[in-house]
């Protein structure tokens, strides 16, 4: 007989990822001797907690826990027994509750103490269910790329850990109420809410990062709607064919389009609007949702929001990938430069319904908001955050990297349970299990 | 008030075209709306047929698509369907129905449900020889 | 395409007391945190009647008594107090993907 070395114990972490429209789980492992390293941490299973976000329940705080449970019986099967007391589990919420909180604080209390009495139940060492704010999502967000592609630090042949010299990623990331932009720069920001410092493994990072609310895919969408409601009569980026009926109340009921509520309107009223297949139209309706007009710094983005010309290469995940890769894969189209993807997003908002539907056949929910999704798009990086074409090249649209989501969970994660040391890792020899 | 009549032969002979208009009255079909015939089997369920849509597009469910074809004629404010070399196993009440889709907002996410809200009362069509 | 099993196919219940249909898909009718279910009410001789969609909203001018709930591929139509008025065929509908399917219905009968 001879004696075997066992492999290391693994340890585990969960996030809930409370989005403005659903909540995802993720659950984190990584082995227990090996904390410090880099890109040891990856993802172990995954969950989609079925319904809406928990923004949706503020009339049903409670159904907002309930709608977790699935996901957490899930958990307790993922995570091994012995490792149940021991695994942190995390619920962060973003956009939609950010906007909750805005107009009814009491019900964003009320849902996240709802969410937190049911975490409470489970034998988890549960650490908290709050808002983040949109700094914490950028960062986290470019946190959880960078350590994936371990563009921090790298273990060398030569037996010791090394700084890569392809320095870090920018990440975009595109939610549902919000988008994200954060990149590291050489030079202080102007303004000093749009800049964080950070100290990773010794390494010091000044990193500029911005949140805009209400530019998310799905609350562009709605803002959209309230412009087509208020200036045409019918929609410019929906297809030719395409009818329906809106309730008013459903439009305007969001903080995102109170600024195009009308004075005195029907919430009650039903409304019908039809789509029109016109690219330019809806290209001008796009357009007014950014203000170019003044800038209190030296350069700003859009809005008045000041922002250092984009550097370096970038990864832009959630929606922003879906969209890009609805027009790659469904529609077969190339999107390699900024031309083409405004070549793509009018080809798709040229599409008739019935074209759209044989083109795309089966899904039909969504269908129709591609073509404004895409010009958003489209528009957003090239107008907005001021990319051109060389520095389009730089950009990569990814949902996944190391079979891990790229997402704000896993930075989320890392910072709160100190997986990433401020202080450079020391010499070590490593132990080989095989 | 929207409201739907279907019409047409009763029986219709194997192999033969089954044939039925449906009137709308209260609203123009160019307007909009999608305008649909389904049918439903001797004590069965329900099965969509296909729509033209008030843009005159189709959509048919592909179980049926070779052999379904629906028309408008818009002077009248009528909608038809034809159906093509017929069997017994289409005998079934036919409805004509008005949809469309429908704007719900849930967790500030806007989506489209395509909902059936206006039906005729239906016509029964026998095939048999 | 989406098939949709209903359960149970007759359900006797007298009234004021509760009703539950369910209905069962065979993949997921929801997508983005939405879910694609409508449920129609269908009375001897009469066509089918809008009664709930997206799962839980209850179409204008129906009784409050009529709820839904559900997503993925479980949903269900509850009556929490039955009238004799309510004797009819109950079917569920998808509209997630085409083509747009139907449940084989449930009968609810009054005792």
């Known amino acids: 007989t001879r004696d075997v070395r066992e492999p290391p114990a693994l340890k585990y972490g969960i996030v809930l990822d409370a989005g403005s429209s659903h909540t995802s789980m993720f659950i984190y492992k990584w082995p227990a001797d090996k904390e410090n390293d880099t890109g040891i941490v990856g993802q172990h299973s995954s969950c989609d907690v079925p319904g809406g976000g928990i923004s949706s329940y503020a009339d049903n705080p409670s159904g907002a826990s309930q709608s977790l449970v699935g996901c957490l019986e899930q958990a307790l099967q993922d995570v091994p027994k012995e490792r149940h007391a021991g695994t942190p589990l995390y619920l962060g919420a973003t956009a939609g509750m950010r906007l909750l909180n805005l107009t009814n604080p009491e019900a964003s209390t009320s849902v996240l103490m709802a969410v937190t009495h049911t975490l409470t139940q489970y034998p988890f060492d549960f650490r908290g269910a709050r808002i983040l704010s949109g700094q914490e999502e950028g960062v986290f967000g470019w946190v959880t790329a960078n350590y994936l592609l371990e563009n921090f630090i790298k273990y060398g042949w030569v037996g010791r850990w090394f700084r890569p010299r392809k320095g870090t990623l920018g990440a975009m990331d595109l939610g549902g109420a919000s988008t994200q932009i954060t990149f590291e720069t050489t030079s202080p920001a102007e303004d000093r809410a749009s800049e964080v410092q950070l100290h990773l493994y010794g390494q010091h990072y000044r990193v500029y990062t911005h949140s805009f609310l209400c530019y998310g895919r799905d609350q562009v969408l709605q803002r959209l709607l309230a412009s087509a409601l208020q200036t045409h009569g019918f929609h410019p980026c929906w297809p030719r064919g395409f009818s329906t009926q809106v309730l008013l109340g459903d439009v305007y009921q969001s903080p995102c389009t109170m600024a195009q509520r009308p004075q005195n309107f029907n919430s009650s009223a039903r409304v019908s609007l039809s789509g029109s297949s016109d690219p330019h139209l809806c290209r001008d309706l796009v357009s007014g949702l950014f203000s170019f007009s003044s800038c209190p710094f030296s350069r700003c983005s859009f809005n008045g929001v000041f922002q250092p010309p984009v550097a370096g290469n970038f990864v832009a995940f959630s929606a922003f990938f879906y969209t890009v890769d609805f027009l790659r894969t469904s529609m077969g189209l190339p999107v390699a430069t900024l031309q083409q993807l405004e070549a793509a997003a009018v080809n798709v908002c040229n599409q008739t319904w019935a074209q759209l539907q044989a083109r795309v056949p089966g899904q039909r929910a969504r269908l129709a908001d591609y073509c404004a999704g895409a010009m958003f798009v489209q528009q957003l990086l090239s107008r907005g955050y001021g990319f051109d074409e060389r520095a389009f090249g730089g950009v990569i649209f990814q949902k996944k990297a190391a079979d891990t989501a790229v997402g704000w969970a896993l930075g989320y994660m890392l910072n709160l349970t100190n997986l990433i040391p401020a202080d450079p890792p020391g010499l070590r020899k490593g132990t080989d299990f095989s | 008030q929207i409201q739907l009549q279907e019409s047409g032969p009763g029986l219709v002979k194997p192999s033969q075209t089954l044939s039925l208009t449906c009137t709308v009255s209260g609203y123009s079909i160019t307007s909009g709306y999608y305008w649909n015939w389904i049918r439903q089997h001797p004590g069965k369920g329900l099965e969509w047929i296909g729509y033209?849509?008030?843009?005159?597009?189709?959509n048919y469910n592909p179980s049926l698509k070779n052999r379904v074809t629906i028309s408008r004629d818009t002077s009248k404010n009528q909608f038809s369907l034809k159906l093509s070399s017929v069997t017994a196993a289409d005998t079934a009440v036919y409805y004509c129905a008005g949809g469309y889709y429908r704007y719900g907002l849930g967790s500030y996410r806007g989506s489209y449900y395509y909902v059936m809200d206006y039906w005729g009362q239906g016509t029964t069509v026998t095939v048999s020889s | 395409e989406t098939v949709l099993t209903q359960s149970p196919a007759t359900l006797s219940v007298s009234p004021g007391e509760r009703a539950t249909i369910s209905c069962k898909a065979s993949?997921?009718?929801?997508?983005?945190?939405?879910?694609?279910m409508n449920w129609y009410q269908q009375k001897p001789g009469q066509a089918p009647r809008l009664l709930i969609y997206a799962a839980s909203n209850l179409e204008s001018g129906i009784p409050a008594r009529f709820s839904g709930s559900g997503s993925g591929t479980d949903f269900t139509l509850t009556i929490s107090s039955v009238e004799p008025e309510d004797a009819a065929t109950y079917y569920c509908q998808q509209s997630n993907e085409d083509p747009p399917t139907f449940g084989g219905g449930t009968k609810l009968e009054i005792k």
């Open positions: 993949q997921s009718v929801d997508y983005e945190g939405h879910s694609y």
């Open positions: 033209i849509s008030y843009d005159a597009d189709n």
